[in-house]
């Protein structure tokens, strides 16, 4: 990636890291308003299976692993990217390495959910306070989950699907920060590990993933009022280990693995028409990216 200053533009979709033949250090940003990609400062260490989030205008890369010809190292790292300076800086590491992690943000705090360290599949969850640069464990999930999708709705943290080390999961659970407790919610219609999970219009969407046999293109959403999961239009491509984010009322899914190919495809879902469209391609195919959108 280039080391010059990033252009000071509005909301961009950032994609960090990923995997193609080995873990990647790319940081790239897509501008949906003009369809362009920016090549930004590389991660200091390549990683796949990471998660991305934005707090206070800064992009955070959380967990993952560095799978390279030299070896394979799960990551406990938290790194912070400043779009104004186009530079990465390390923050306090998590208590344990977490590959194929999920993250969510509540009240400016980053929650790191599940993930794996070697063959250990975590149910533990920890919270990062950027002002103090500190991590603290909170209540563990009821289920061990890697490849877990995480989303925040109404200041509640949802952990959806994943893999417990034996089975891929359709179960989901919700964390209540005030009570510091997890409760199961209605299970999805479909087993999904490595799905893309996000929130749009008061619903939690789960897109794609892997059911233990095949990659999926199906998409379902959870209505917190009715506590039910309903299918919406499927994506054009089957994909697991995809990136997902929401930008201006639309869902974007980035890359992933379809069982044969590392996808460069980026699809966009319009909830008004219940349709998916191909909007762009990443500069190269990859799975296991961390994705987030900058604030205004």
């Amino acid at each position: 990636g280039s080391m010059g200053h990033a252009p000071k533009v509005g909301r961009l979709i950032y994609t960090a890291g990923g995997y193609f033949r080995q873990s990647l250090s790319y940081l790239e940003a897509y501008n949906p308003s003009d369809g362009t990609w920016l090549d930004l400062a590389d991660l200091q260490v390549p990683r796949s299976g990471l998660a991305g989030c934005v707090v206070g205008g800064l992009l955070y890369a959380v967990g993952g692993r560095n799978n390279s010809p030299d070896g394979n190292t799960d990551s406990s790292a938290l790194d912070c990217y400043n779009p104004m300076t186009n530079q990465w800086s390390p923050c306090a590491p998590m208590s344990v390495p977490r590959n194929r992690i999920g993250v969510g943000v509540i009240d400016g705090h980053i929650y790191a959910v599940g993930g794996s360290h070697g063959c250990i599949h975590h149910n533990s969850v920890e919270r990062y306070e950027p002002e103090r640069d500190e991590w603290h464990l909170v209540a563990p999930m009821l289920t061990r989950r890697i490849g877990v999708g995480v989303a925040v709705l109404n200041r509640l943290l949802y952990a959806v699907g994943g893999f417990d080390g034996t089975n891929r999961l359709n179960s989901a659970e919700c964390y209540y920060p005030e009570r510091n407790e997890w409760r199961m919610i209605t299970a999805m219609n479909t087993i999904r590990s490595g799905a893309g999970v996000c929130v749009l219009h008061n619903c939690i969407y789960a897109a794609g993933g892997y059911d233990g046999q095949d990659q999926l293109n199906s998409v379902e959403r959870y209505d917190v009022e009715t506590e039910t999961w309903t299918f919406v239009a499927p994506m054009k491509h089957r994909r697991s280990a995809l990136g997902i984010t929401v930008h201006q009322g639309r869902i974007y899914v980035l890359g992933g693995y379809d069982g044969h190919t590392f996808l460069d495809s980026v699809e966009c879902y319009d909830p008004d028409t219940d349709t998916w469209s191909e909007v762009t391609r990443m500069t190269s195919g990859r799975s296991g990216v961390g994705v987030a959108v900058t604030m205004e």
Epitope: Y19, R21, S48, G49, N67, G71, N72, R100, G118, C119, I120, G147, F163, G165, T166, S193, G194, Y210, G212, Q213, D214, Q215, S240, A241, Y257, G259, F262, S287, G288
Partner: antibody
């Protein structure tokens, strides 16, 4: 019945290449990790490579990294091990196996012998 | 890399004997240890996974246990078909590694 059948072994000169195949039946290779393990004549077992069906990520032993490539074709239900820049110390019986139970491997093929010699 | 030190490298026993084979991991591998049986010219067969879980179809005379970083395969009453080489394997940490094998021979 679950079966794995390796093929593609043989005699090759140092520096040469071979592509091993592992044809699976009785299960879908998209549903399990696939591993290659080798055994030099009269020696023990050595894990070589694996592929994850969910993420597509591959892992390699340091002794083969950069020279060997594991892949899978789910339409043919077959896994492959492409071996380049072969060395005498790569001489072994190569087994493919199915990862289950935290990557303990529950089914193995019969093995295919690779001999690297001039 | 994690070393799996297997002992003994060989042993002689009689039908009906109780046989114990040990693997010591050079660092913690949790319970991510499997045991395999291999006969000459054949592929290995899974006996035990997750340190102590008996694989489907394996006779109950085989058992596995863990004490810290020490792992044990026990054959409670050796049968003629049990004369073979036995390997332990850890899959806790990359790369997966095997013990060097224990050959069980007829006394």
């Amino acid at each position: 019945e679950v079966q794995l059948v390796e093929s593609g072994g043989g005699l090759v000169q140092p520096g040469g290449s071979l592509r091993l195949s592992c044809a699976a039946s009785g299960f879908a290779i998209s549903a399990s990790s696939i591993h290659w393990v080798r055994q030099a004549p009269g020696k023990g077992l050595e894990w070589v490579a694996s592929i994850d069906p969910e993420t597509g990520e591959t892992l390699y032993a340091k002794s083969v990294a950069g020279r060997f490539t594991i892949s899978a074709d789910t339409s043919k239900n077959t896994a492959y091990l492409q071996m380049n820049s072969l060395r005498a110390e790569d001489t072994a019986v190569y087994y493919c196996s199915r990862g289950q139970y935290g990557d303990a491997t529950d089914y193995w093929g019969q093995g295919t012998l690779v001999t690297v010699s001039s | 890399d994690i070393q799996m030190t297997q002992s003994p490298s060989s042993l002689s026993a009689s039908v009906g004997d109780r046989v114990t084979i040990t693997c010591r991991a050079s660092q913690s591998v949790s319970s991510a240890v499997a045991w395999y049986q291999q006969k000459p010219g054949k592929a290995p067969k899974l006996l035990i996974y997750s340190a102590s879980s008996l694989y489907s179809g394996v006779p109950s005379r085989f058992s596995g246990s863990r004490s810290g970083t020490d792992f044990t395969l026990t054959i409670s009453s050796l049968q003629p078909e049990d004369f073979a080489t036995y390997y332990c394997q850890q899959s806790y940490s990359f790369p997966s590694t095997f013990g060097q094998g224990t050959k069980v021979e007829i006394k």
